[in-house]
Interface confidence: medium
């Protein structure tokens, strides 16, 4: 028996359902009584879901997995993972045994988009050219960690005085806070781009300083 899975990682958004595709080619006369199907975590060998002895043995993994029982006889051994969490990320191996056996691994990549950045300025009044200001760009609840880029109004990258914090909450999602310290020109725009490297999603925030008032 030959097992086939997607070579590309499956990208799933947090809290959505994902399908890890796995298929085999049943011989003529194949019945489910002959099938032993096991899904497990590749690294730890932890059992995720199984079909043995002619029946679905159910989820061994937080009761969020399911097979496609009506499609098994056609050779579809795919696994449905519900309400995806950050901790589900990784490699899953599909083992199929009929008379002989084969296995293949599929990678699950978990992602969550970052919120539109909020921009804060310190100090935020009585600003003059030559003043040192701190601009903070904050974006929330993304995964994995973001790449953060700063640019001025002409699109020139600002890489100098930047510090970035990325902290995970109890669900494993990250909040990002990036701080740019800059000496003000006569007027200027400062833009922050928060990129999710898996989704290739860019979230933009900017602040324009033109004397008073400030524009966000």
């Amino acid at each position: 028996v030959e097992v086939q899975v997607s070579e590309d990682p499956v990208v799933a958004l947090v809290d959505t359902d994902a399908t890890l595709r796995c298929s085999f080619s049943p011989e003529p006369g194949f019945s489910l009584a002959q099938l032993n199907l096991i899904w497990q975590l590749t690294d730890t060998k932890q059992l995720v879901h199984s079909f043995t002895e002619g029946r679905d043995q159910g989820s061994a993994y937080s009761n969020r997995t399911a097979l496609f029982p009506d499609l098994l006889v056609q050779g579809n051994a795919s696994l449905r993972l519900q309400r995806v969490r950050v901790t589900d990320e990784g490699s899953y191996t599909c083992f199929v045994s009929i008379q002989d056996f084969d296995s293949a691994a599929v990678s699950l990549q978990v992602a969550a988009p970052y919120s539109k950045p909020s921009m804060t300025l310190e100090p935020n009044k009585d600003l003059r050219p030559g003043n040192m200001v701190t601009i903070t760009c904050s974006s929330y609840q993304g995964y994995p960690e973001a790449e953060v880029f700063w640019k001025d109004g002409q699109g020139v990258p600002l890489t100098g005085n930047v510090t970035t914090s990325q902290m995970a909450n109890e669900r494993g999602l990250f909040d990002v806070h990036s701080v740019l310290r800059v000496v003000l020109g006569a007027n200027g725009t400062y833009s922050c781009l928060v990129r999710n490297p898996v989704l290739q999603q860019d979230a933009h925030g900017s602040v324009t300083i033109t004397g008073q008032p400030l524009t966000f």
Epitope: P9, T42, D43, V86, T87, E89, G90, S91, S107, L108, Q109, V110, P144, E145, A146, E147, T163, T164, S165, Q166, M167, A168, N169, E170, G172, F174, R195, P197, V198
Partner: antibody, heavy 120, light 112 residues
């Protein structure tokens, strides 16, 4: 327990590019939640963070080295690599690869280190 | 960047006696999620650093319970209740709150 092993030349000439590879075993580089890192230690000195990469390609570099550093990943070989351009004697150090756990921001596994000397 | 200052830089200890290392941060390492992003590492002679304590006070897997981390905000302490010969090396604190991640300058523990 995941194992990390650094490899590459131990001697690099000034102005050239330092290239190192870290091979990960007993664990997949594609397992989520970990960030694959480079840290260096100048002779007899403390530790300096260089940068890290996520398996999907997102990179994060120390501002002081950002203009000279590239970190890349090859998930098919379970490896990640460091390139540092325009090296000088000040880049002579033991270079460590390490795994950073995203949830705690900690370097929980380290390679044995490789001494790279920059000299003509 | 965040600066971590360790003291003492050298610590001679008699086996069986306690030891204490201080790490002071230039800014608070407490984040709004309630976690404190301060780690401790030990680099034994000729070896790479090994992970001891994470998030301020949690022992890493396999670390003996004679090691404990404490502190909050900007002041942190690593305590060894009874020093053993195998504990010699350089101890580093590290902040994981903000890039660039930074380490203390190290405290060398040696046996008297």
């Amino acid at each position: 327990q995941v194992q990390l092993v650094e490899s590459g030349p131990g001697l690099v000439k000034p102005s050239q590019t330092l290239s190192l590879t870290c091979t990960v075993s007993d664990g997949s580089i594609s397992s989520g939640g970990y960030y694959w890192s480079w840290i260096r230690q100048h002779p007899g000195k403390g530790l300096e963070w260089i940068g890290y990469i996520y398996y999907s390609g997102g990179t994060y570099y120390s501002p002081s080295l950002k203009s000279r550093v590239t970190i890349s990943v090859d998930t098919s070989k379970n490896q990640f690599s460091l390139k540092l351009t325009s090296v000088t004697a000040a880049d002579t150090a033991v270079y460590y690869c390490a795994r950073r756990a995203g949830y705690s921001s900690s370097f929980d596994s380290w390679g044995q280190g490789i001494l790279v000397t920059v000299s003509s | 960047e965040i600066v971590l200052t360790q003291s003492p830089l050298s610590l001679p200890v008699t086996p069986g006696e306690p030891a204490s290392i201080s790490c002071r941060s230039s800014q608070s390492l407490l984040y709004s999620n309630g976690y404190t992003y301060l780690d401790w590492y030990l680099q034994k002679p000729g070896q790479s650093p090994q992970f001891l304590i994470y998030l301020g006070f949690n022992r890493a897997s396999g670390v003996p319970d004679r090691f404990s981390g404490s502190g909050s905000g900007t002041d942190f302490t690593l305590k060894i209740s009874r020093v053993e010969a195998e504990d010699v090396g350089v101890y580093y604190c590290m902040q994981g709150l903000q890039t660039p991640y930074t380490f203390g300058q190290g405290t060398k523990l040696e046996i008297k």
